[in-house]
Structures are given as structure tokens and as C-alpha cells.
Amino acid sequence: SGTTNTVAAYNLTWKSTNFKTILEWEPKPINQVYTVQISTKSGDWKSKCFYTADTECDLTDEIVKDVKQTYLARVFSYPAGHVESTGSTEEPPYENSPEFTPYLETNLGQPTIQSFEQVGTKVNVTVQDEWTLVRRNDTFLSLRDVFGKDLIYTLYYWKSSSSGKKTAKTNTNEFLIDVDKGENYCFSVQAVIPSRRTANRKSTDSPVECMGHEKGESRETGHHHHHH
């Protein structure tokens, strides 16, 4: 019979960063393989990752169709070597995932400082806009395109010679900050969605970039450093 020795998947977990979304589960299969289905609350089930021995399934292509929808997935367990049979009416064991709303729950990926430029006592710091797999009219959208003003960046900056940090915020991808002339500064940024009230409202901090280390250009000194 079709489901002998098969066990339901468990620990179904959504792993999602910048809308790249993978469903993971346990256990590593022994006598079984898995098929995943996903749907919106009002939609039909769509099958993905047919008869896989993996314990994960990339569902990005489905959730990017509407990142503000709420999705539910389920993982079915079939006997290893299973070939779908029209005669089988026995439903295989399955487990439902938690609900997942990409716009509210995808983690913000680590941002990158694209460049900084010093003019006198001002420094312009630019954050790289990350591309996502969300599309509009066959064009991939950036993180800023998707979140708009819901997404802000926090800049942490400090003199290379001290540890006292200052902060600035922007709802664009650029900061313009005042600095002391003749001092080198270090920078790190963090992406934030202030409207979120959960642990995923902030990204991890970007790598630290410091003046005089390849990332920016200074009109003070005439040295030009280009971002690779």
C-alpha cells in the first residue's frame, strides 16, 4: 500500500531573506521522498519539488507573485521509488507549514556600503540597493522598489581614532553627514523596517568601511578610490 513506512515531515520552517524563500523540514528521508505544495489562503494548491529526497524546497518563484499575500505550504511523504499511480486513493501523510507573509516576514539581508564621498566637512554615504527576485512587468525590483518608504537605513559612524558611535537615518539609500575636517571615519549600515514589531525588523550590520580604504573618494586630498 502506498504509504507503508512513510512518516510525516516535521519542523517545517520558512527561511527567507530579501524574498529568496526556502521551506525546510526534517527528517532526512530513509524510505520516503517528499513533494511540496503551496497555496494562498484563497488559492489552489500548486505542487513543487516533486518526489525529492532533499529536505528543502525553493518556493521563491511562487511567493514573489504577490509578496503581500499569506502563504501556506505542506509537505507530503511518499515511499522511496514512488511513481504516481492513478489507482491510489490513499492520501500520503503530510504536515502543514506555519503561515508565511513575505512582505512582513522575509529577513532583510546584510546591506553593503556602495561608496562614500567626502566634500569638505560633509560625507555622502551610499547604500547599495539590493535586487530581489520580485518582478513587475518582467523587471526585477530592488529592495527599495518593494518596500518603498517602509524601509529605512541606519548609519553608524565613528572616528577611526575613537569608539564613540553616532547614528543617522534615511528613508532613501543615501546619507549626508557632518564630519570633522582631517579625521578619518568608519561606517556601518543596517536596514530597518520600523513598522515591523518582530525580531526580523532589522538586518545584520553591513561590513565596516573606513575612509582611506578603497571604498570612497575624497576631494580634499585628490585621491580617488573606486569601488570594485
Epitope: 526556502i22 532526512k28 530513509i30 532533499d54 515511499p79
Partner: antibody
């Protein structure tokens, strides 16, 4: 045949981050296996740290989870271990290994069939 | 966490003798997840047995594995000089994957 080679600093200062890389040669890291890190304290047994699938999904030992990050670079056929806030208790030989799912006669079997030679990491100031 | 307890801790035997090593799990482990490894000083572990009873490629037939559930056994039918080493059982089914504490097989 597939070979694994660990690389990274042999000496790390307390509170710093231990970083090791495992390079896969003679095969592809994207070939459907899991890739693990294991360590062995001096004169002691083996401790599994965590594993990564080529797609980037990870499983970690809960006892180390708060300090461990394992990542993969499929373009270089490498996977890496970062262990933060190290202490002398993290002094060990660190091994990378391939965890293979093997399908036979209607079922899957799992085992670590290829190991690196190991690299000794000492945590000391 | 599944605790694997190996016994004895040390086994003192002569070449040609039979070695029987035990691995007991704190909860049931599918045989598909149970493996045995051999480790010599200064070397990485080497896979001997997977699936509780299947020999890995290139492993001599004097090594055999058996058992199911919570009790597993590695048997070396006739010890050769190169077999004196430490042997570990391991389960790779339930996170965290765990190893037994090892059994040292030494020359008597």
C-alpha cells in the same frame, strides 16, 4: 575522487572569531551531499558542529548554534566555518567532511565518507 | 539529543583475536543513520560501516556491523596489526548528530 582540505589560521585569540574554509576538489560541492564540520578536542572524542547543503540551508549543533555560522560558495567549491567569541575550550582539531545520502534498494543511508585531514586550532592570547 | 554510549572504553586483545564493540543509543536510531568509524593517531576518522551493517568501499570483510533500535555492534573477526585504533559509532539522523565516546582497541 573527492578530497577535502581545511585551511585557516592555527592560532586565534580569545573572544575573536575562528574562521576556517574547506575546499572540495575532485568533485562538485553542488552534487547533492551535505557538508559538515566536526571537531575533536585534544585526547577526546568527536563533536559535530553543523552541516550545510549546497543551496545554503544549515543544521547546527544546539550547543554551539549561537556562535556558529556555516556558509557555502558553490562557485569556488568551498564551504566555511565561523565560530565567534572563542575561548580556550574551542582549542581542537577541526575536520570538514562530506555527509552522503546513498540510495539503495528503496531506501536512503547517510554517512560521512570523505574527511579532510584536519587542522589544529589553538585559542590563546 | 541522542547519547551514544560505547563499551568497553578500552579493549586489550592480541592479533588474531576477535573484537566485539558495543554502541548503545539513549533512544531508538534507524539503522539507516548509524555508522562506524576507525581513527588512528594523527589521522582523520575513516568510514567502516554505514546503515549499521553495510561495509564501506575498500573495507575488509573481517569488519562487520549488526544491530537495530538502540543496540549496535561492530565486530572484527580476526584482528590484524593495522586494526589497533579507536572506533566510534555515530548517528546522523537526529540533530545534533552525535558520536559515541569511542572504544580503544589496543595490543595486549
Amino acid at each position: 575522487q573527492v578530497q577535502l582540505q581545511e585551511s585557516g589560521p592555527g592560532l586565534v585569540k580569545p573572544s575573536q572569531t575562528l574562521s576556517l574554509t574547506c575546499t572540495v576538489s575532485g568533485g562538485s560541492i553542488s552534487s547533492g551531499q551535505y557538508w559538515s564540520w566536526i571537531r575533536q578536542h585534544p585526547g577526546k572524542g568527536l563533536e559535530w558542529i553543523g552541516e550545510i547543503y549546497y543551496s545554503g540551508s544549515t543544521r547546527y549543533n544546539p550547543s554551539l548554534k549561537s556562535r556558529v555560522t556555516i556558509s557555502v560558495d558553490t562557485s569556488k567549491d568551498q564551504f566555511s566555518l565561523k565560530l565567534s567569541s572563542v575561548t580556550a575550550a574551542d582549542t581542537a582539531v577541526y575536520y570538514c567532511a562530506r555527509d552522503t545520502p546513498y540510495y539503495y534498494d528503496g531506501g536512503y543511508y547517510y554517512y560521512m565518507d570523505v574527511w579532510g585531514k584536519g587542522t589544529t586550532v589553538t585559542v590563546s592570547s | 539529543e541522542i547519547v551514544l554510549t560505547q563499551s568497553p572504553g578500552t579493549l586489550s586483545l592480541s592479533p588474531g583475536e576477535r573484537a566485539t564493540l558495543s554502541c548503545r543509543a539513549s533512544q531508538s536510531v534507524s539503522s539507516s543513520y548509524l555508522a562506524w568509524y576507525q581513527q588512528k593517531p594523527g589521522q582523520a576518522p575513516r568510514l567502516l560501516i554505514y546503515g549499521a551493517s553495510s561495509r564501506a568501499t575498500g573495507i575488509p570483510d573481517r569488519f562487520s556491523g549488526s544491530g537495530s533500535g538502540t543496540d549496535f555492534t561492530l565486530t572484527i573477526s580476526r584482528l590484524e596489526p593495522e586494526d589497533f585504533a579507536v572506533y566510534y559509532c555515530q548517528q546522523v539522523g537526529v540533530v545534533p548528530y552525535t558520536f559515541g565516546g569511542g572504544t580503544k582497541v589496543e595490543i595486549k
